[in-house]
């Protein structure tokens, strides 16, 4: 229904706390360099204005669209051009072009320092002094670093943060209470960020149809007892929610997500038997819980997929009459039978089926042509299964750090032109798949591994788009989203690459490395490893292991030495010489 004042409608629906949080996220995602105080001031002004519209929907400007209201606020910021350069040109445009322009200027890799967690005592002090401001800082810092973070989910993580601080700040040993819990939230939030970015990429590059196909597959796996009409309704609603969030319409997105959660909980009987626990929770927890609810038990009496999609005499007729609906039912039926497949794989199978019908239905004897289509799925299914087996075996043998290093070598050989920080970040993220997925039961590994890898590779593609340097990466990133992972997996050593000159300073280290946290030490060593591969792309695994072991031994020795500086300055050059010899 149409509302006289959109802003009043959203304020009433969401309540002041969520309204303010979402406006803060929106501003932080659009203008990523502004300070918290600048954004907090704007949020307060918008909230005060929303309250006047709630009191009188006919008041001046209350009938304006949210894009107009928010855009006008952003464009009124002083020194916009000095701080944001050409983004300021967006302000010369009218809506909806102005919002599109803001979206295009979102930076997936803003040059902001890493979000450092304050010391436990300091954190608890500022949390106790002003919990609202503390949580505002959290929303601002995360949102500006992750401009496509799913806004209602970020409110959920802020709520988690709040609960952890409330609990741990009352304990004697705040540090040991906070660290593991906050690390857990951070890890989950980072995964949520790359997953959502993938959804927005799907929407931006391939449109709503592509996202809806993803949603149909995912929902059919989770809710195999829901009928096709129910799955289609959920997929349509979920597509709308994601389109809004990806498009910066965060108030509408959060409101519609709450509506969708309400609908699911009111219609559990026709959706799934597993929803009750989620539906008993308050809003943010409920929506989060529903988004990752366990798969319902598959119906026992599902007929073979071939009956309707291969053996039926009317396959081509049904396909001709309504292509999207027929392919949608195929995707639904295949997905509900295969919770053990990744969504990417299911979409590849649906694409193969569509291509087969396109070809076969134009022949004189279609059934003879498409009769073998299910057998032709076999190699498509085997490829990711082998990938999972090979990589999980390697992870179990090497552990997370060693597995990351193996991936780093592999990817540096595939795309040596890519910057070392990007390669290290990608390899570290890709390597986490082991810890995340390889410990799961067999039937959950494939969906976990492949869908996670796809999301990480999407980030690689986004970073590479900014400064394209590798033809290999461009080739894999230009295709469809579901083909990316197999494309990257199939890449081999880039034969066109001219090896980097050996620079001693790249491998020169100082005593300050000794005091770095373990994670930072690992990154330093992985940076050196990537540089070694760039110098010798065809170095054997044995050669690289020799060098890295020597390097680890060198660090260990010098960091234990009484005079660390002298050790680094005398032993360092010897290490460099040994490295050169080992790789000669």
């Amino acid at each position: 229904e149409a509302h006289k004042s959109e802003i009043a409608h959203r304020y009433n629906d969401l309540g002041e706390q969520h309204f303010k949080g979402l406006v803060l996220i929106a501003f932080s995602q659009y203008l990523q360099k502004c300070s918290y105080d600048e954004h907090a001031k704007l949020v307060q002004e918008v909230t005060d204005f929303a309250k006047t519209c709630v009191a009188d929907e006919s008041a001046a400007n209350c009938d304006k669209s949210l894009h107009t209201l928010f855009g006008d606020k952003l464009c009124a910021i002083p020194n916009l051009r000095e701080n944001y350069g050409e983004l300021a040109d967006c302000c010369t445009k009218q809506e909806p072009e102005r919002n599109e322009c803001f979206l295009q200027h979102k930076d997936d890799n803003p040059s902001l320092p890493p979000f450092e967690r304050p010391e436990a005592e300091a954190m608890c002090t500022s949390f106790k002094e002003n919990p609202t401001t503390f949580m505002g800082h959290y929303l601002h810092e995360v949102a500006r670093r992750h401009p496509y973070f799913y806004a209602p989910e970020l409110l959920y993580y802020a709520e988690q943060y709040n609960e952890i601080l409330t609990q741990c700040c009352a304990e004697a040993d705040k540090e040991s209470c906070l660290t593991p819990k906050l690390d857990g939230v951070k890890e989950k939030a980072l995964v949520s960020s790359v997953r959502q970015r993938m959804k927005c990429s799907s929407m931006q590059k391939f449109g709503e149809r592509a996202f809806k196909a993803w949603a149909v597959a995912r929902l059919s796996q989770t809710f195999p007892n829901a009928d096709f009409a129910e799955i289609t309704k959920l997929a349509t609603d979920l597509t709308k929610v994601n389109k809004e969030c990806c498009h910066g319409d965060l108030l509408e997105c959060a409101d519609d997500r709450a509506e969708l959660a309400k609908y699911m909980c009111e219609n559990q009987a026709t959706i799934s038997s597993k929803l009750q626990t989620c539906c008993d929770k308050p809003l943010l927890k409920k929506a989060h819980c529903l988004s990752e609810v366990e798969h319902d038990t598959m119906p026992a009496d599902l007929p073979a997929i071939a009956a309707d999609f291969v053996e039926d005499q009317e396959v081509c007729k049904n396909y001709a009459e309504a292509k999207d609906v027929f392919l949608g039912t195929f995707l639904y039926e295949y997905s509900r039978r295969h919770p053990d497949y990744s969504v990417s794989l299911l979409l590849r199978l649906a694409k193969k089926y569509e291509a087969t019908l396109e070809k076969c239905c134009a022949e004189a004897n279609p059934p003879a042509c498409y009769g073998t289509v299910l057998a032709e799925f076999q190699p498509l299914v085997e490829e990711p299964k082998n990938l999972v087996k090979t990589n999980c075996d390697l992870y179990e043998k090497l552990g997370e750090y060693g597995f990351q290093n193996a991936i780093l070598v592999r990817y540096t050989q595939k795309a040596p032109q890519v910057s070392t920080p990007t390669l290290v970040e990608a390899a570290r993220n890709l390597g986490r798949v082991g810890t995340k997925c390889c410990t799961l039961p067999e039937d959950q590994r494939l969906p976990c591994v492949e869908d996670y890898l796809s999301a990480i590779l999407n980030r690689v593609c986004l970073l590479h788009e900014k400064t394209p340097v590798s033809e290999h990466v461009t080739k894999c990133c230009s295709g469809s989203l579901v083909e990316r992972r197999p494309c990257f997996s199939a890449l081999t050593v880039d034969e066109t690459y001219v090896p980097k000159e050996f620079k001693a300073e790249t491998f020169t280290f100082h005593s300050d490395i000794c005091t770095l946290p373990e994670k930072e030490k690992q990154i330093k060593k992985q940076t050196a490893l990537a540089e070694l591969v760039k110098h010798k792309p065809k170095a054997t695994a044995e050669q690289l292991k020799t060098v890295m072991d020597d390097f680890a031994q060198f660090l260990d020795t010098c960091c234990k030495a009484a005079d660390k500086d002298t050790c680094f300055s005398t032993e360092g050059p010897n290490l460099v010489t040994r490295c050169k010899d080992a790789l000669a």
Epitope: Q313, C316, A320, E321, C361, A362, E363, A364, P366, A368
Partner: nanobody, 115 residues
Framework: EVQLVESGGGLVQPGNSLRLSCAAS????????MSWVRQAPGKGLEWVSS????????LYADSVKGRFTISRDNAKTTLYLQMNSLRPEDTAVYYC????????SSGGTLVTVSS
């Protein structure tokens, strides 16, 4: 919405000819193979002939081979069946269908071969 409308049937003496037409709409005609199927009184559906989307490949049931010719005009989105040397056993309702289907969702056209 997919529509298939057959025409050209009628009463004909054995040994004579008829040309059936099927006007198609509501789908990408050239992307689909098309078939003719028939149903004699009191019998089940019988496949008669098929043609590929481009018109380059054709298939015929043994019972009509050498007598019937299937063709199509993609520009006019129309399917044809030229029936020569008709026999009494060709008496049936003829339906055009999409793909190699034996379905009969259209109205059909009656062909009666009798002296």
């Amino acid at each position: 919405e997919v529509q298939l409308v057959e025409s050209g049937g009628g009463l004909v003496q054995p040994g004579n000819s008829l040309r059936l037409s099927c006007a198609a709409s509501g789908f990408t005609f050239s992307s689909f193979g098309m078939s003719w199927v028939r149903q004699a009184p009191g019998k089940g559906l019988e496949w008669v002939s098929s043609i590929s989307g481009s018109g380059s490949d054709t298939l015929y049931a043994d019972s009509v081979k050498g007598r019937f010719t299937i063709s199509r005009d993609n520009a006019k989105t129309t399917l044809y069946l030229q029936m020569n040397s008709l026999r009494p056993e060709d008496t049936a309702v003829y339906y055009c269908t999409i793909g190699g289907s034996k379905s009969r969702s259209s109205g059909g056209t009656l062909v009666t071969v009798s002296s």
